[in-house]
Structure formats: C-alpha cells, structure tokens
Amino acid sequence: IPVIEPSVPELVVKPGATVTLRCVGNGSVEWDGPPSPHWTLYSDGSSSILSTNNATFQNTGTYRCTEPGDPLGGSAAIHLYVKDPARPWNVLAQEVVVFEDQDALLPCLLTDPVLEAGVSLVRVRGRPLMRHTNYSFSPWHGFTIHRAKFIQSQDYQCSALMGGRKVMSISIRLKVQKVIPGPPALTLVPAELVRIRGEAAQIVCSASSVDVNFDVFLQHNNTKLAIPQQSDFHNNRYQKVLTLNLDQVDFQHAGNYSCVASNVQGKHSTSMFFRVVESAYLNLSSEQNLIQEVTVGEGLNLKVMVEAYPGLQGFNWTYLGPFSDHQPEPKLANATTKDTYRHTFTLSLPRLKPSEAGRYSFLARNPGGWRALTFELTLRYPPEVSVIWTFINGSGTLLCAASGYPQPNVTWLQCSGHTDRCDEAQVLQVWDDPYPEVLSQEPFHKVTVQSLLTVETLEHNQTYECRAHNSVGSGSWAFIPISAGAHTHPPDEFLFTP
C-alpha cells in the first residue's frame, strides 16, 4: 500500500500556503484529486510529489494515491482543507444527475473543519427543503440526499455559519430522473372494430410513461397519420393521446391500425384491425358435430359460436321435439363474450332423460336478420329385454323383444337347470341372430328388434335365455318351461317391465 507524507488523515492550511504531498510506493504511483489550479506534479520512479506554493480554497479536497501495479489495488488518502474566511465552500460540480431512489451527493466541500457544526442544506433563495427530505453531511464529501425523488429536482445551496451569519455556496442543480422501466405503456381501443360503410368510427391510441420524453404515433397500413395530440399528466404519469375520428367510414379506411410509442428504452407497438362491411351480418357455427349421441343419464353441453355486427337484438334456445313440449330452462343457458363481435352460447343439459332427446335450436337475431343452428340429440340406452312363448304357424316359438339404442344384437342360449342367467358351465347351445326383425326405428327413439326361436319341444329342466347387448350395456330374460305350462322369469337385472 502506498504511503503519503505528511502521514496525517487531514491537513489544514491557510490560503497562499505552500503544500507538498509526497507519495511513495513499491512501484510507480499516481495521484487523484479534485480538479483545481496551481498544482505541480513531479514523479520519480516509486515516488510522486504533488505541490503548490499558493494554496486556494479550490484546492480543498481529498487526494488519493494509488499504485496501478498493485494487484490488491491498495491506496492511501489525505484530505486538504484550505480555510479561507471568505470562502467556506468548495463546490466541485454545479449539476448532479441521479435516478429516483439513488443517493444524490451534492459535492460542496467545507474548507474549514471547524465550521461543521453550523452547516445546513437549503434550496436557493433561502427556501427550506421539501418535507421528507432525508439528508446527511460529510465535511470531506458534501451533502447526500438519500433515496432522491423526482420532486426533489431543485437548485440547492450549502450554508455555513461564520461569525454569526450564514454564508452560502454557489448553487448546485439536482436533476432526479424517473427510472424508466421500459418503453411507454400503450393502449389502442377498440381492440377490433367493425362498421357498416357510412357509419362513424373512433380509434384511440394512447401512451403513457413516467417520463415526458417519449413519442407516439398512429399508423394505418404502414402510413403515419397526422392527428393532433392531447397531453395530460395524472397518476404520476405523462399521457399522450391520439384520437382518430371518422364520420363516415368507407372501405379505404379498413385495415390494420398500429399505435407506436418510443422512448430512450425502446419502442412498443400494438395493433388492431378495422373491418368495413357493406351490411349487417350474423353467422352461427359450432365446433361440435350437430348430430350428438349421449348415453341416457349423462350430461351434455351444446355450444354455439356467434359472429355478429351490429350486436344481437335477441337470442334463445328452443326444443323442437319430438317428445314433450318442455323448453330448456333459462338457468341452464349461458352466454359468454369472447370479444365485441364474437360470443359463445352454451346450453347445458345435465343428466339427460329420455323425453329430452330430439332437436335443440339456437336462434339469434340482429338488424341483419335471424339465423338458427339446430342440434340433433339422440340418447343411447342399454337394451331392455322380454321373452314370451307363443305359437306361430302351429310351431312353438320363443319370441324375444329387445329395445335400446344403438340397435341391440340378440343371442339365444339354452342351458341346463332352472336359472336366472345361464353361466358358461351350464350352456348347452348358443344361437346368434344376426338379423333380428326391426319392429320400430323412429328418430330419437329406442330401436326395438324381435328375434324368434322355434322350439319343437320345450325341455322342462332347462332354461332358454335371450340376451341383447349394444355399446351401452346388456340385458337378458330367462324363460323357464314348467310342466304346468310355459313360465317366464325375468331376472332382476332387467330394465323392462312387461
């Protein structure tokens, strides 16, 4: 570490005095201090001498000696006071620029350490400091305003009490700049615009920033528009607003509009699209298939997307049958707006009942007319089965009716013993009926099929079972012949009560 002679931390001299500061290090050394007149510098290898034979108050300051070749970067310092009775302050800079929340050092150096007790900081023309100004003083460095605020951008003077009167320094202008986090914030409204040719339209581009230095412009299809700018300041932000008013829009006004704002931090831009149409429009669509199949008891949401201009004058869901005359409950219908011209309408159908199968229509109306979108809802049902014994053309026949949706498949089983349901171990014969006769097949209803099993002789210690299945489930009916005549026995699983 370099060594300074005289080896004192502070040196107090009078104006006109001769001052010699000598620094010695292991290698070459350098001096650093406040810019002031009358110093001469003499270097000789590992020592450097800073001297003046006419010290003035402007030589007041801290002089630091460093050894550039020292990897530890050691230094030594001495503070020089040149105490001039007429000049208590040496001001090193008349303008200080900091960002908000930084500490601002106002570099008025006291020329006489004895005066430290009577120093203060004021604004020019003797005005007091603003409330909540938090500052401290160091005779070596000056006044520090801690965590400076934009509002503290003022002209300041350092004051010292000399012989009962206050002596001021020259003024120091403090500029506290707002921290600009990035380019100005932008809004462009509306985000999307549709108008019929001849209607009026307004597009508003506004930008705001904590700093007044920013530019904003509105462009249409890459052409900058000449629009008068309105400026305002509120919520601690500067605001610049461009308003484009179009009394009667035409097709050439359509296209892309961009709002662009820039400052030292960069550029922001946001865009919107303006569509000019010949007349009102209303379009209905759905991402869902318009033909829906759901298992009975399940829930279903029907969703319709609406694109319209002007806005809707009315809309509703209607049940078109073919069953009851019930209408969807309004509480089950729900509307959400994606944006100004697009909406989604949902009809919620919880725990569907058989009477709720059929056609559901969404109707909407605007000045362009009315449109409808219709869904067809078919319910799926597990098969219901029943078996009866009858004679057809003189032959004993088991007749199985199965009803469900989708159309059930039918299988006959013959098994030994009397049982509610044939299990594998008991099965004697199996007949698949690939083409049962379709008895009824109306839209939105169950499909009823009939399968005949001709039996020459009913074996009394056996069971004949008709099984039906589809994608939803299965059902069966066991027929148990008894000596007193044919007897049918529906096992407990059957959904059908004959």
């Epitope: 008891g297 399940e298 829930g299 949401n301 729900n334 919620s348 919880p350 725990r351 009942k353 058989p354 009477s355 959904l495």
Partner: antibody, heavy 116, light 106 residues
Framework: QVQLVQSGAEVKKPGSSVKVSCKAS????????ISWVRQAPGQGLEWMGV???????NYNSPFMSRVTITKDESTSTAYMELSSLRSEDTAVYYC??????????WGQGTTVTVSS | DIQMTQSPSSLSASVGDRVTITCRAS??????VSWYQQKPGKAPKLLIY???SLQSGVPSRFSGSGSGTDFTLTISSLQPEDFATYYC????????FGQGTKLEIK
C-alpha cells in the same frame, strides 16, 4: 312434512336378493324422481340409480345388471331390489328425493348386511 | 364417470375458526355441485346446491363457490354442531361424490 321413511335393516346370504322400500310423504312420486345412494361402512357415497316420474329408470353401470328400481304411486312407495348379493354389498342404502341437480331429502337409511 | 376429488380428507379446527374444503371435478361440471353434511349414524343433509345456493334452513355461515372444475365450501365461524363429515357431489352426469372430509375438533 316432507320425508322419506325406509324399511328396516336386513341380513342376507350371499347370492340372495334384498328389496328395500321407501315411503314418501309430503310430496308425490308423480312429481319427483327418486334416486338410491349407498354407503359402505366407513366409505363415501355411491349413486345406484333413479326412477323418474314417468316410471322410467336409469342405473349406474356398476349396478346395471343387478339392481331394479320400481315404485307404486298408489302407496307413494319406491323400491330398490339388489340381486346376487355379495359381502361387498354390505352398506347403508338411502332413498333420496332427486331434484336432478341435487338430492334434497334423504331417507333415514336401511342397513343391509350380507353374510354367510 | 366424473371423479370428484376432495381435500383435505380430514381437518382439525376449533370453534370460531374459518374452514375451507375444496373439491375438484375431473371435467367441467358447470355449477352442478352440491355439498352435504353427514353426522355419524345419520343420513347426509343438503347444505349447498348449484355450487353457491344455500339450502333453506341451513345457517348462513355455510357458503359455496366455484364453477367448471374447482369448488369450495366455506364455514365462516365453526360452531360445535358443525363437526361432521362433508361430501361434495356433482350432478352434471351420473351423480358422483367426493370421498369426504372429516372435520374434527382440535
């Protein structure tokens, strides 16, 4: 007042059937659906099926092959029959008034114990 | 089937506490969620239906919220009679219930 009163506790052998009754008072089975919900010991609630006002039924798939729900409107009584009983069917069975979107009236419950 | 996942499965609290129980559906069930309270040896009792509607006769300290897949039952200030098991249930499709939340005295 509006209530559902169920039949008493049953002890059944595996493979047999049980039929639980549920008598409604203060409202009609022609205007309200009835669902059945069961609760195994220390377990949660499990919906079994519903009988609608028109007499149609809808069953939860785990029970579809074994459960039959019926009703007798003249006596305002609903029934739930469960066949091919096994030990895991030991539970409390509740009949409930089904408002489609929630169950607002519950019977006191019928304990069915399946044990050999 | 739609799964209803309730949390927590058990909860200790004191009289006067504010308690929240949540329920998550495996798919969108709109607002077709109800909450039930069950005390030992008794049938469940309806508290909330339609996610947020208070059943007649139920104290106003009970409230429900949510839609879509996430639902909440809140008891604003626990009373001694509120210690019980609570179930959520959905009725958009085949009814299903959460596994229950047992609320115990701390």
């Amino acid at each position: 007042q509006v209530q559902l009163v169920q039949s008493g506790a049953e002890v059944k052998k595996p493979g047999s059937s049980v039929k639980v009754s549920c008598k409604a008072s203060g409202f009609s089975l022609t205007t309200y659906d009835i669902s059945w919900v069961r609760q195994a010991p220390g377990q949660g609630l499990e919906w079994m099926g519903v009988i609608w006002t028109d007499g149609g039924t809808n069953y939860n798939s785990p029970f579809m092959s074994r459960v039959t729900i019926t009703k007798d409107e003249s006596t305002s009584t609903a029934y739930m029959e469960l066949s091919s009983l096994r030990s895991e069917d030991t539970a409390v069975y509740y009949c409930v008034r089904d408002q489609r979107l929630y169950f607002d009236v519950w019977g006191q419950g019928t304990t069915v114990t399946v044990s050999s | 089937d739609i799964q209803m996942t309730q949390s927590p499965s058990s909860l200790s609290a004191s009289v006067g506490d504010r308690v929240t129980i949540t329920c998550r559906a495996s798919e969108d069930v709109n607002t077709y969620v109800s909450w039930y309270q069950q005390k030992p040896g008794k049938a469940p009792k309806l508290l909330i239906y339609g996610a947020s509607s208070l059943q007649s006769g139920v104290p106003s300290r009970f409230s429900g919220s949510g839609s879509g897949t996430d639902f909440t039952l809140t008891i604003s200030s626990l009373q001694p009679e509120d210690f019980a098991t609570y179930y959520c249930g959905q009725s958009f499709s085949y009814p299903t219930f959460g596994q229950g939340t047992k609320l115990e005295i701390k």
